[in-house]
């Protein structure tokens, strides 16, 4: 999906209002400095591409983020403010329908959510103080 035509201001507002709080709750008890930055983004559409990938694509060590509250809200926000996004996600949603018991949060999932927080921070601000 090409995130170029999303309403970035609306997505930013949703992030600040709800998604950020859910991410921070998930990370509670963990310092952001506990993990080094392993993923970056270079403009707002690129940030959303990487946020989508980290949030919804299962990885071998952290398979269940898509079921978390912040992920559901992220999906709703992208569907609301990115034209045509929800249509591209129908197949992915059907694949996720079989729900399992939520696993205990692993260190790898904490690391992944730490990277997500970093990507969102890059998305919501004009990154560089100058230039």
């Amino acid at each position: 999906y090409d995130f170029t035509n999303c309403d970035f201001q609306k997505i930013e507002a949703d992030y600040l209002r709800t998604i950020s709080k859910d991410l921070i709750t998930y990370m509670s008890g963990t310092k952001s400095t506990d993990f080094n930055n392993t993923v970056s983004c270079s403009n707002r559409p690129h940030c959303l591409t990487e946020i989508q990938s980290l949030t919804f694509n299962p990885t071998p060590r952290c398979a269940s983020l898509a079921k978390e509250m912040f992920a559901r809200k992220t999906k709703a926000t992208l569907a609301l403010w990115c034209p045509g996004y929800s249509e591209t996600q129908i197949n992915a949603t059907q694949a996720m329908k079989k729900r399992r018991k939520r696993k205990v949060t692993t260190n790898k999932c904490l690391e992944q959510v730490s990277q997500l927080l970093g990507l969102w921070r890059r998305f919501i601000r004009t990154l560089l103080k100058k230039q």
């Epitope: 080094n36 270079s42 560089l128």
Partner: antibody, heavy 122, light 108 residues
Framework: QMQLVESGGGVVQPGRSLRLSCAAS????????MHWVRQAPGKGLEWVAV????????HYADSVKGRFTITRDNSKNTLNLQMNSLRAEDTAVYYC???????????????WGQGTMVTVSS | SYVLTQPPSVSVAPGQTARITCGGN??????VHWYQQKPGQAPVLVVY???DRPSWIPERFSGSNSGNTATLTISRGEAGDEADYYC???????????FGGGTKLTVL
């Protein structure tokens, strides 16, 4: 463990070519800008080139423009520097480094490789 | 193109404060980054965006930037701080990375 490992250095005659490589691991390579920086023996750091995270755009120092080419393969997590028409003044340790970027602005180089030595001598 | 000027050397007594300057035309309008390099080793980022510090760098390292001068401050100097220090900016008009000439810090 985030890591950059350079290879390909060696001794080469003036006018000849050499290709350096940098293998990245432990981070999402395709999301970072990547640089080559060199350091002549006993001298300071000299920036050589940078390539955008996407590989679509490159920038070079005047001293290497037209002779050196920076490329990347995001599917293999590798960065390359093709060095042609080498001169004695290209003798240096060559480092690769990663840099987040925002639009067309590159930020600090937060991870560096250990370097590979290139000696241009007849 | 843009030029950054550093003093070739700075000395500090153990436990005292060292200040390394980096001069450039209106450098205060740019983000300055500082690197430490010990002999035979790769550079290490110690301060970025004028005054921010990577999580692995001690609080003794700090930075400031205004006008035509950026400054790296190392408080409570230790023998392990002996190294070459380089300032760096991104020149967005010429699309170039620019390094200062480097400053050798000696802890007496």
């Amino acid at each position: 463990q985030m890591q950059l490992v350079e290879s390909g250095g060696g001794v080469v005659q003036p006018g000849r070519s050499l290709r350096l490589s940098c293998a990245a691991s432990g981070f999402t390579f395709r999301t970072y800008g990547m640089h080559w920086v060199r350091q002549a023996p006993g001298k300071g750091l000299e920036w050589v080139a940078v390539i955008w995270y996407s590989g679509t755009t490159t920038h070079y120092a005047d001293s290497v423009k037209g002779r050196f080419t920076i490329t990347r393969d995001n599917s293999k997590n590798t960065l390359n520097l093709q060095m042609n028409s080498l001169r004695a003044e290209d003798t240096a340790v060559y480092y690769c480094s990663r840099s987040p970027q925002w639009e067309d602005i590159f930020e600090s180089m937060d991870i560096w490789g250990q370097g590979t030595m290139v000696t241009v001598s007849s | 193109s843009y030029v950054l000027t550093q003093p070739p050397s700075v000395s500090v007594a153990p436990g005292q404060t060292a200040r390394i300057t980096c001069g450039g035309n209106n450098i205060g309008s740019k983000n300055v980054h500082w690197y430490q390099q010990k002999p035979g080793q790769a550079p290490v980022l110690v301060v970025y965006d004028d005054s921010d510090r990577p999580s692995w760098i001690p609080e003794r390292f700090s930075g400031s930037n205004s006008g035509n001068t950026a400054t790296l401050t190392i408080s409570r100097g230790e023998a392990g701080d002996e190294a070459d220090y380089y300032c760096q900016v991104w020149d967005s008009s010429d699309f170039l990375v620019v390094f200062g000439g480097g400053t050798k810090l000696t802890v007496l």
